[in-house]
Each structure stands twice: as structure tokens, then as C-alpha cells.
């Protein structure tokens, strides 16, 4: 899923307030939610019909410093005899999540919302027509 | 997948440097790869075997304002005759994400990060036991 | 118009291992998975595997799992294949050939192909 | 592997002629492609979903079949056809390719 442009209007003062200096806003620390119960994920990248794979990336300068990326394992789907149905496609499912990037000069430190395409995991689907004409 | 907890360190100051003052950071306007493209959804959740809706939620004081959440539409999977298979289970794809939170009192505008859990798709898996014992 | 264009031929002792190139032009290349054929002399055609460069999805034939390895680079959209361990019977034209995109049409769906490589294993 | 027998193997006929290519597969399969291969040259789909033609082929070519017997025909034989031909099974893990009929003219 796509996230909407921002406009930059989400960042502004009401029009009746001094503008923001400088281009920048006021970020208070720490996260809400941060503790939320996130219920385990019991292995469905091995067990789904559209098998994944999980690749790490990892950047220090980056909040969350680990993103996880999946990849689909097979170009077909798995049926019950284990093996792969070449009438199905495994195909990724992808969402644009925010991360925040950190940039430092000395003791001056900055941050900024940057937009990220995980691949979240994979869903077997029956393409539209079969064959290409 | 989860993100990691902050532990507050990625956004303080090097430890040489004077700690951040009001407890708040500087977020610079803008957001990096805003315009990144994002290919068609191609409508894979009406064309998969663990077919999914969405419902929209929205909030004006969040960025995105929009967050789409999927509901897996059965809990068999469609099998190749469009019939659900029970022996098969339809299972939600979750994704923690991140949100800005804007507060305001007046002309005094501050932002602050959000973890959101967001169902973003379905998969279809073989049930790890298939009875209760 | 969709263009595929694979590297020269090759000539490799047995042992050594050999990486075909596959320069895909006038598409989007994440969007299509690509496949790749061998044909031996006087040999019919075989259908080695396929991978997805979007999804990092592959698919081989058992026939040459541990032989062939498949990959691309998506900024450079181009598909590889590496053959490892060349025997003799790995003589051979290989073919890469583009698949559907796996949502209109199935990844297994071959419509455009590539011009060849020969590989000879010869000592 | 399901696997795919053609034939004849090779076969000689003159311009004009009806010309009938069998493939027959061990077991049975949903779809079934046709491909030409000239000399020298890449094969090209000529027949995909048993009986469609593919686009830019001409109608003398045509494709039937089901279960594991599928034929492709070509209606009046010219000399640009002179070349293999290949059926392939679209219905199971991996794709499965005949052995080849080479055609030529008499």
C-alpha cells in the first residue's frame, strides 16, 4: 500500500501562527505504543503456499536500524503434495512504511521521515489470463 | 515483523555533546523518496487464495492520515473450483509501522513517532496440527 | 520493443565454471520473471529454471539444481546464469526467455527470447 | 517430470501438403504449446493454449487436442516452414519440451 504525498500542510503551523524556522519541526522523544504486543509470526513464511525467505538490511543511522525484507521463494505456489503448481504465482505483498533517518554534523544532530518499500511476505494468487498473447 | 525498541540512544546527542534541551529533537521538513514509485496493486487480494479486504482508518493528526488495514475474507483458502478449502488456513500478514503523531496547543506544534501494527495481506498455510487432541 | 541480449560464447575446461549475461531492454525489468533454456546438440529443449527480480522468487528444475545458479541485477537489468563444475555434457546453447509478470499473466508464460550462447566444455 | 513424445521425429513433405506433428505426454496435461524453431534461430511460439494461435502466425497453422494427444497441423505446407518444432507442457513442475519433428521439403 502507498502512502499519500504529504503536502507538507500535515508539518505547518495553522496559518494564523509564526512559521516553523528554519524548515524544521519539534520532535518529542520516545515512541507511543512502543510496548505493543506484536503476536508471534509461528513460522508462516514456512508454512504459507507462497513460501518466503527474510534478508536483514541494517543501517545505524536509520530508526528501526533493522529492516526486514522478504522474498518469495518459488515462482509457483506449493500444493498439498509439496510440490510447486506452476498455474499459481507466488508474488510479494509490499507496503511503504516510514522510517527516520539521522544526520549528524558534530554536536548538531537532524532527523527526517523517509519512505521505505518493505516486502512484507508472500500470497499465491491465479494470474489474470495464462498465457501471454 | 517488529520493530525494536528505541532504548532512546539513536535520538541523543553523542555523549561529548550537551544533552538535547525540553526533551525534543529537530525534525527537518520534507520527507526522503517521497515520490519513490510503487508498482500497481494489480488487485492480488480479490486474486488470491487467501483473498482479503480493506478497511481505511483515518485520523487528521497522523501522517499518513490514511492507514489501510486488510481482514482476511475467509479462514479456508479458495482452492482452483473458487470453493474454501478447510483444510487450509487464511492467516494475516502483519507489518508494525511507523506513524507521526502532530499535538498541538495553539500555535505550539510538536510531532512525536507512533508504532501502528498494520495487517497489510494474507497468506495461505498448512495448519502446523490439524486436530486438537 | 522488448530486447534481449545475452553475452558471447564461451569456451571452458571441465571444472571451471562459466556466468551467461542477459541485457533486457524495452520493458520493466523487475516486472518479468526471466527463464533460461538449454539446448544440447541435436538435443531437445530443456527448461532449466526461472526467477522472479522483483520477489527474488526461482524456480529450478531438478535436473539442474547445484549446477546452475540464477541471478539478477536489477539496476543494471540484467539476468545471469552460472553454470558450475562444466562437464562436457554442458556443451550447449543457453537461452534466456522472457516469463509473465505472475498477476495478468503466469511467470511460466515464455514469450520473448534471447539470441544464444554456446558454451563449449572442452579440454 | 512429465515427459513428451513427438513424431514422427523428422519428416519430408512437399509444398502444398497437409502436414500433422503428434505429441504425446505421459500424462495428462491441461495446455499445450507449440514452438518453431528455424535454423539457426530462435524458437518462436507458434500455437499456446493447445489451439491459439500465437500473434503474427500465419492460419495454416493450427493446434488440437486434450488429455496427453495433442497435433499441430499445417494446412498447406510452404517453404518457409522448413524447420523443428517443439510441443510443451504447460500443466506441472518443470516445463517439459518434446524432442523435436524437423520438417523439410521434398
Known amino acids: 500500500r502507498k502512502i499519500p504525498k504529504v503536502g507538507h500542510t500535515f508539518f505547518q503551523k495553522p496559518e494564523s501562527c509564526p512559521p516553523v524556522p528554519g524548515g524544521s519541526m519539534k520532535l518529542d522523544i520516545g515512541i507511543i505504543n512502543e510496548n505493543q504486543r506484536v503476536s508471534m509470526s509461528r513460522n508462516i513464511e514456512s508454512r504459507s503456499t507462497s513460501p518466503w525467505n527474510y534478508t536483514v538490511t541494517w543501517d545505524p543511522n536509520r530508526y528501526p536500524s533493522e529492516v526486514v525484507q522478504a522474498q518469495c521463494r518459488n515462482l509457483g505456489c506449493i500444493n498439498a503434495q509439496g510440490k510447486e503448481d506452476i498455474s499459481m504465482n507466488s508474488v510479494p505483498i509490499q507496503q511503504e512504511t516510514l522510517v527516520v533517518r539521522r544526520k549528524h554534523q558534530g554536536c548538531s544532530v537532524s532527523f527526517q521521515l523517509e519512505k521505505v518499500l518493505v516486502t512484507v511476505g508472500c500470497t499465491c494468487v491465479t494470474p489474470v489470463i495464462h498465457h501471454v498473447q | 515483523r517488529k520493530i525494536p525498541k528505541v532504548g532512546h540512544t539513536f535520538f541523543q546527542k553523542p555523549e561529548s555533546c550537551p544533552p538535547v534541551p525540553g526533551g525534543s529533537m529537530k525534525l527537518d521538513i520534507g520527507i526522503i523518496n517521497e515520490n519513490q514509485r510503487v508498482s500497481m496493486s494489480r488487485n492480488i487480494e480479490s486474486r488470491s487464495t487467501s483473498p482479503w479486504n480493506y478497511t481505511v482508518t483515518w485520523d487528521p493528526n497522523r501522517y499518513p492520515s490514511e492507514v489501510v488495514q486488510a481482514q482476511c475474507r475467509n479462514l479456508g483458502c479458495i482452492n482452483a473450483q473458487g470453493k474454501e478449502d478447510i483444510s487450509m488456513n487464511s492467516v494475516p500478514i502483519q507489518q508494525e509501522t511507523l506513524v507521526v503523531r502532530r499535538k498541538h496547543q495553539g500555535c505550539s506544534v510538536s510531532f512525536q513517532l507512533e508504532k501502528v501494527l498494520v495487517t497489510v495481506g494474507c497468506t495461505c498455510v498448512t495448519p502446523v496440527i490439524h486436530h486438537v487432541q | 520493443q522488448v530486447q534481449l541480449v545475452q553475452s558471447g560464447a564461451e569456451v571452458k575446461k571441465p571444472g571451471a565454471s562459466v556466468k551467461v549475461s542477459c541485457k533486457a531492454s524495452g520493458y520493466t525489468f523487475n516486472e518479468y520473471t526471466m527463464h533460461w533454456v538449454k539446448q544440447a546438440p541435436g538435443q531437445r529443449l530443456e527448461w532449466m529454471g526461472g526467477i522472479n527480480p522483483n520477489s527474488g522468487g526461482v524456480s529450478y528444475n531438478q535436473n539442474f539444481k547445484g549446477k546452475a545458479t540464477l541471478t539478477v541485477d536489477t539496476s543494471a537489468s540484467t539476468a545471469y546464469m552460472e553454470l558450475s563444475s562444466l562437464r562436457s555434457e554442458d556443451t550447449a546453447v543457453y537461452y534466456c526467455a522472457r516469463g509473465g509478470d505472475g498477476y495478468y499473466t503466469n511467470y511460466f508464460d515464455i514469450d520473448y527470447w534471447g539470441q544464444g550462447t554456446t558454451v563449449t566444455v572442452s579440454s | 517430470d512429465i515427459q513428451m513424445t513427438q513424431s514422427p521425429s523428422s519428416l519430408s513433405a512437399s509444398v502444398g501438403d497437409r502436414v500433422t506433428i503428434t505429441c504425446s505426454a505421459s500424462s495428462s496435461v491441461n495446455y499445450m504449446h507449440w514452438y518453431q524453431q528455424k535454423p539457426g534461430k530462435v524458437p518462436k511460439l507458434l500455437i499456446y493454449d493447445t489451439s491459439k494461435l500465437a500473434s503474427g502466425v500465419p492460419s495454416r497453422f493450427s493446434g488440437s487436442g486434450s488429455g496427453t494427444d495433442f497435433t499441430l497441423t499445417i494446412s498447406s505446407l510452404q517453404p518457409e516452414d522448413v524447420a523443428t518444432y517443439y510441443c510443451?507442457?504447460?500443466?506441472?513442475?518443470?516445463?517439459?519440451f518434446g524432442q523435436g519433428t524437423k520438417l523439410e521439403i521434398k
Open positions: 510443451q507442457q504447460w500443466n506441472s513442475h518443470p516445463l517439459t
